[in-house]
């Protein structure tokens, strides 16, 4: 809608709304994946730089996260991933470049990669939500 402020100009109240929408999607995706892929370890080679270091409180680094979800989309629950991507797009700074992410070719490594992304994203949302709640409210 033309009424909507450009996505990178949303106030903390709207960012909080988006985080609240993302949390159950992320949690559900992670829990389902853990049930389906039991015994898969977290990868120590994948680091999701999900928070910006240049703002206080830290904000979700949507441009850094989006490529990972686009990359794992064909290998996970597409419906849920699409909903996550839709929300992350709303938080993205306009004209911020997105890097290409390649998924490991090895099946086991690929599963470990996906699990790590989902775990780190869930932790990241928790961190941002806490910082939004501990602000001057």
């Amino acid at each position: 809608s033309s009424h909507m402020a450009p996505t990178h100009q949303l106030p903390p109240s709207d960012v909080r709304k988006i985080i609240l929408e993302l949390q159950p999607l992320s949690r559900g995706l992670l829990e389902d994946y853990q049930k389906k892929e039991t015994g898969v370890p977290e990868s120590n080679r994948t680091l999701l730089l999900c928070l910006t270091s240049d703002s206080q409180p830290p904000r979700l680094n949507s441009s850094a996260i989006l490529p990972y979800f686009r990359a794992i989309r064909p290998l996970s629950d597409k419906n849920i991933i699409d909903k996550i991507i839709e929300q992350l797009d709303k938080l993205k700074f306009q004209h911020e470049p997105e890097t290409e992410i390649s998924v490991p070719a090895d099946t086991f490594e690929c599963k470990s990669f996906i699990l790590t992304i989902l775990q780190q994203f869930s932790a990241c949302l928790e961190s941002v939500f806490k910082s939004l709640n501990s602000g001057p409210q």
């Epitope: 909507m4 402020a5 949303l10």
Partner: antibody, heavy 118, light 111 residues
Framework: EVQLVESGPSLVKPGGSLRLTCSVT????????WKWIRKFPGNKLEYMGY???????DYNPSLKSRITISRDTSKNQYYLQLNSVTTEDTATYYC????????????WGQGTSVTVSS | DIVMTQSPASLSVSLGQRATISCRAS??????????MHWYQQKPGQSPKLLIY???NLESGIPARFGGSGSGTDFTLTIDPVQADDVATYYC?????????FGGGTKLEIK
């Protein structure tokens, strides 16, 4: 044209529960955010909380222990339940639509007056 | 919570004159150059009606006699010229931070 209509009891006993309905026409409650606000005698307004298009709820911390907002998408209605009411909850209760991030509440109901008294 | 202080509480203006209502937030409601402050009008027995969103944007269908300005913590609603139909209570509110908070209202009367 979007219309919101509040309904519910006009009198509630102290210690009881207040349950209000907001009936929405002209838009689906499965898009946007659907809010409750109340106006106390003397015109002070208080934001109470919302239910989102997906069913996520968020409440004003001042009411968190007493408030529940729910919905019935088949009826295109959403609800406010406030427990353990006191005379301080006497107010006019409004429902309102928040259609888009970065915008404002654009449609409000006409309000329903609730008195808490024994 | 952000405290919204609206003034004056009541205002009496002659037809055709200008009415000015102020709203001050206890902290800035701006982000990246946008102000998340809004104004609405309420007539007795009627639904509140959105007039101005994000400080200065006129809502669709609202006459251009209504205008909003300001940024940061200080905001103004202007009605020029005032018409008989403008008799109402006017409120500001911020949607910058949760919980959203409201001004105390300004009752506009005609002299």
């Amino acid at each position: 044209e979007v219309q919101l209509v509040e309904s519910g009891p006009s009198l509630v006993k102290p210690g009881g529960s207040l349950r209000l309905t907001c009936s929405v026409t002209g838009d689906s409650i499965t898009s946007g955010y659907w809010k409750w606000i109340r106006k106390f005698p003397g015109n002070k307004l208080e934001y109470m909380g919302y239910i989102s298009y997906s069913g996520i709820t968020d409440y004003n911390p001042s009411l968190k222990s007493r408030i529940t907002i729910s919905r019935d998408t088949s009826k295109n209605q959403y609800y406010l339940q406030l427990n353990s009411v006191t005379t301080e909850d006497t107010a006019t209760y409004y429902c309102a639509r928040y259609p888009n991030y970065g915008y404002a509440m654009d449609y409000w109901g006409q309000g329903t007056s609730v008195t808490v008294s024994s | 919570d952000i405290v919204m202080t609206q003034s004056p509480a009541s205002l009496s203006v002659s037809l055709g004159q200008r009415a000015t209502i102020s709203c001050r937030a206890s902290e800035s409601v701006d982000t990246y150059g946008r102000s998340f402050m809004h104004w609405y009008q309420q007539k007795p027995g009627q639904s509140p009606k959105l007039l101005i969103y994000r400080a200065s944007n006129l809502e669709s269908g609202i006459p251009a006699r209504f205008g909003g300005s300001g940024s940061g913590t200080d905001f103004t609603l202007t009605i020029d010229p005032v018409q008989a139909d403008d008799v109402a209570t006017y409120y500001c509110y911020q949607s910058y931070e949760d919980p959203w908070t409201f001004g105390g209202g300004t009752k506009l009367e005609i002299k």
